[in-house]
């Protein structure tokens, strides 16, 4: 009888250790998500929808660090480009640093050469300030080099290694950006 109780106690202790391990793993996962909240949602979405897909970017997208980029093969006006990206679960490119700008311009040189590509930058009609599509301001080094003479709405685009501005209703290629999915392995 005592041996039976002892065995049960050992089994319960083993279960408790396993649960503690699981809790520790979960706590660690939670902490890493809190540290990288920005990418955590994308990671969870990946786990939900494509548990076996280990690729951080979809087919035909280019990866750099935590981002995936899609260079369009069609022309459209800025607003339609914005919608096209959204349909694919992305937004027009938002350039956060010179390093990212260099990567983009370098990639474009390899892919297509010197064309115009809409990015998610547009000028506020009232203040004339440049803003990214989420409402944030670009860093001083990432402002379009020339002010468009257009009386219409003005949007930003990349050409060669420069950020320029143009009437939003002109037709250009465009670049979409989404967060790269982190491997669940």
């Amino acid at each position: 009888k005592l041996l039976q109780v002892s065995t049960i106690a050992m089994q319960q202790q083993e279960k408790l250790i396993q649960q503690e391990r699981a809790l520790l793993n979960f706590t660690e996962w939670k902490r890493s998500c809190a540290l990288q909240m920005k990418y955590c949602q994308a990671f969870m979405q990946n786990s939900l929808s494509s548990a076996h897909n280990s690729s951080p970017c979809p087919n035909n997208w280019i990866q750099n660090r935590e981002s995936c980029y899609y260079v369009s093969e069609i022309w459209s006006i800025w607003h339609t480009s914005q919608e096209n990206c959204l349909k694919e679960g992305s937004t027009l490119l938002q350039i956060e640093s010179k390093e990212e700008m260099d990567f983009i311009t370098g990639s474009l040189r390899k892919i297509k050469g010197s064309y115009d590509y809409w990015v998610g930058l547009s000028q506020d009609g009232h203040s004339g300030r440049w803003l990214w599509q989420d409402g944030s301001s670009p860093s001083p080094g990432l402002l379009p080099a020339e002010r468009s003479q257009s009386a219409n709405q003005v949007c930003g685009y990349v050409k060669s290694n420069s950020l320029l501005s143009s009437n939003c209703s002109t037709w250009k290629y465009f670049i979409c950006e989404k967060y790269a999915l982190r491997s669940s392995v």
């Epitope: 994308a42 939900l48 929808s49 349909k87 679960g89 409402g135 950006e177």
Partner: nanobody, 116 residues
């Protein structure tokens, strides 16, 4: 098949606020994105704001700084908080969802009227 139901529209004075909700029949965390569009009489339907599966946000230039898009994955609901409303914001507001194959699904729409 994704079903979407908007609510929260109504009549408001210029300068006022409204909050639109869009309840989805699926887990919105599995969608490519959700978006709000609007259609004013005699005008084309236009994108107002959108939020991607990864949480990226985009706004139309005309509403940036006044409108805020958000979502609650647990409730499978997207929201559009509209502040400092103007008469030109008067329109039928539609919620849209794009699934993994970029197929669009639309709600029935909710009327927003801003009086001066």
């Amino acid at each position: 098949q994704v079903q979407l139901q908007e609510s929260g529209g109504g009549l408001v004075q210029a300068g006022g606020s409204l909050r639109l909700s869009c309840a989805a029949s699926v887990n919105i965390g599995t969608l490519n994105s959700m978006a709000w569009y609007r259609e004013a009489p005699g005008k084309q339907r236009e994108l107002v704001a959108g939020i991607t599966g990864g949480g990226q946000i985009t706004y139309a230039n005309s509403v940036r700084g006044r409108f805020t898009v958000s979502r609650d994955i647990a409730k499978s609901t997207a929201y559009l908080q509209m502040n400092t409303l103007k008469p030109e914001d008067t329109a039928v507001y539609y919620c849209a969802a794009y699934d993994r194959s970029a197929t669009p699904y639309w709600g029935q729409g909710t009327q927003v009227t801003v009086s001066s």
